[in-house]
């Protein structure tokens, strides 16, 4: 069977521009190495937001300058994206690849619509 990936339909970022969601995959095999990629789809353009490869049971390691952090538990990955602004509102897609051992499987979620509202600036106090 092809691999199914589930993620929430909608998430609202908090006032600090941080959004978190769970990406869950139904693994057809016993993978030991998994790659998780967050993609952003705007209009028909798809760009990579961040990616991490992890060994099952270990922490996800994103690049130092990544706006993403995450943890894994079984077939669930808890993803957090930071530093979001209103212009970053869009569809964020979770892509999961079972890299090792073979056979390779890929699964793509339907996407999570993340809404980001820039906080109102505080009024000057006299």
């Amino acid at each position: 069977k092809a691999m199914h990936v589930a993620q929430p339909a909608v998430v609202l970022a908090n006032s600090r521009g941080t959004a978190s969601f769970v990406c869950e995959y139904a693994s057809p095999g016993k993978a030991t190495e998994v790659r998780v990629t967050v993609l952003r789809q705007a209009d028909s353009q798809v760009t990579e937001v961040c990616a991490a490869t992890y060994m099952m049971g270990n922490e996800l390691t994103f690049l130092d300058d990544s706006i993403c952090t995450g943890t894994s538990s079984g077939n669930q990955v808890n993803l957090t994206i930071q530093g979001l602004r209103a212009m970053d509102t869009g569809l964020y897609i979770c892509k999961v690849e079972l890299m090792y051992p073979p056979p390779y499987y890929m699964g793509i979620g339907n996407g999570t619509q993340i809404y980001v509202i820039d906080p109102e600036p505080c009024p000057d106090s006299d």
Epitope: M3, H4, L39, V46, I108
Partner: antibody, heavy 118, light 107 residues
């Protein structure tokens, strides 16, 4: 813009070897899985091999296992296919293709023809 | 290995007509199905991915549908440049297989 340019094709005798190259430009090469696909004259498309983000992670079609080796040099933005023990049935146009972010093969090279004949 | 079967092998139609191409998978591939167009002497060109999403620059006369194991590519009104061979492909798991192709030629 994304460009993939294959080279290294030609006429070779059965049992000999050939190495194909695919020069990539216009994108972050190391962030993408890269594939070789071939097409025998007048026939359909056949997937040959893939190399993933880490050069150690590769997969092959049964027809390529044990004879073909896919590799990449991320510093040179180049994909390779080393073909050994070539047979007449390996005669084909060989294409390199990028595995896009959403999985399908979103960019293809123009192909290089390999003819195995005595 | 997932086997893809395409039908018909050849479709003879006139410009302006509607073309319906079928692709059947030997097992469920969810939505990891793409369609490619190939003209003689050229590399394949992606048309549709994820069953129904059009690739960049593809006109809206091309549409894809289906789920599970049965998929369809529809060209609503054939233009002269649409006469070519069309391949379906599954990309959800190794090995990444292509269908044998459907040739759309001018009647």
């Amino acid at each position: 813009q994304v460009q993939l340019v294959e080279s290294g094709g030609g006429v070779v005798e059965p049992g000999r070897s050939l190495r194909l190259s695919c020069a990539a430009s216009g994108f972050t090469f190391s962030s993408y899985g890269m594939h070789w696909v071939r097409q025998a004259p007048g026939k359909g498309l056949e997937w040959v091999a893939v190399i993933w983000y880490k050069p150690s992670e590769k997969d092959y079609a049964d027809s390529a296992k044990g004879r073909f080796t896919i590799s990449r040099d991320n510093s040179k933005n180049t994909l390779y296919l080393q073909m050994n023990s070539l047979r007449a049935e390996d005669t084909a146009v060989y294409y390199c293709a990028r595995g896009g972010l959403l999985g399908y093969f979103d960019y293809w090279g123009q192909g290089t023809l390999v003819t195995v004949s005595s | 290995e997932i086997v893809l079967t395409q039908s018909p092998g050849t479709l003879s139609l006139s410009p302006g007509e509607r073309a319906t191409l079928s692709c059947r998978a030997s097992q469920s591939i969810n939505s990891y199905l793409a369609w490619y167009q190939q003209k003689p002497g050229q590399a394949p060109r992606p048309l549709i991915y994820g069953v129904s999403s059009r690739a960049t620059g593809i006109p809206d006369r091309f549409s894809g549908s289906g789920s599970g194991t049965d998929f369809t590519l529809t060209i609503s009104r054939l233009e002269p440049e649409d006469f070519a061979v069309y391949y379906c492909q599954q990309y959800g798991r190794y090995p990444f297989t292509f269908g044998p192709g459907t040739k759309v030629d001018i009647k």
